[in-house]
């Protein structure tokens, strides 16, 4: 089955700085979406070659792309602490393929010893993250493509 | 709120033609990748074909060929350009986020065909 491979599996920054994420394919993609899970997941980013990218207006400013969207590294700049969350690259292919996640700690610089990430990786997986709810429609019912995670198209 | 409008449908012969079109409110669906869907009585529903923002497009190999997916984001709405319609074609068509980004449905669009 095909895999997205993200990495980091978690990093911890100060406010005010700037982390990667890279989002990596087999082939086969035809664009690809960074989300940020949680209670009201969104998307933060849609990057698809040859298209001006769309990023979510909370990180507009903030967001630079390097290489093509079979290998995306997505730059997020003057981290807040509200950003703090967990990032998963979600892959259009004939179905839909999410990245194992990235959880970003953004810490106060004095308080940084406190947070620290584990080094276990979590694993990538074809198979879709948990659902939760959302305002937007759910086509996967009673369909070959797997269920995949609610969320918020980008405004 | 989320809505999403089919139209297009019809009784249509072997070898005929039809375009459906849906019109998508409430989401923000220029950056959305929308899907054409059908389900067939009895039958699950299935994806017959998804277009991203970029326009690029997939099909199954059981229309690939026949049907043709577009969109216009200015308009919201994506259409589905169905040709050499085949009996086994006949079916309620959907359209919607090919990512299932919640649980709504539109009503949908009979398509028969029949000779």
């Known amino acids: 089955a095909q895999e997205v491979q993200q990495s980091p599996h978690c990093t911890t920054v100060p406010v005010g700085a700037s982390v990667n994420i890279t989002c990596s394919t087999s082939g086969g993609l035809r664009g690809i979406y960074l989300r940020q899970l949680g209670p009201q997941p969104q998307d933060i980013i849609y990057y698809e070659d040859g298209v001006v990218p769309t990023t979510d207006r909370r990180f507009r400013g903030r967001i630079d792309f390097s290489g093509s969207q079979d290998n995306l590294t997505i730059t997020m700049h003057r981290l807040q602490l509200s950003d703090t969350g967990t990032y998963t690259c979600q892959a259009i292919t004939e179905v839909n393929v999410y990245g194992s996640g990235t959880l970003v700690l953004v810490t106060e610089e004095q308080s940084q010893g406190w947070h620290r990430c584990s080094d276990a990786p979590p694993r990538a997986s074809a198979l879709p993250a948990p659902p939760t709810g959302s305002a937007l429609p759910d086509p996967q019912t009673a369909s070959a493509l797997p269920d995949p995670p609610a969320a918020s198209a980008l405004p | 709120a989320v809505q999403l409008v089919e139209s297009g449908g019809g009784l249509v012969q072997p070898g005929g033609s039809l375009r459906l079109s849906c019109a998508a409110s409430?989401?923000?669906?220029?950056?959305?990748?929308i899907g054409w869907y059908r389900q067939a009585p009895g039958k699950q529903r299935e994806l017959v074909a998804s277009?991203?923002?970029?326009?690029?497009?997939t099909y199954p190999d059981s229309v690939k060929g026949r049907f043709i997916i577009s969109r216009d984001n200015a308009k919201n709405t994506v259409y589905l350009e169905m040709n050499s319609l085949k009996l086994e074609d006949t079916a309620v068509y959907y359209c919607?986020?090919?990512?299932?980004?919640?649980?709504?449905w539109g009503q949908g669009t009979q398509v028969t065909v029949s000779s």
């Open positions: 277009i991203t923002p970029g326009g690029r497009t």
């Open positions: 409430g989401f923000t669906f220029s950056n959305a990748v």
């Open positions: 919607n986020d090919f990512r299932g980004l919640g649980g709504y």
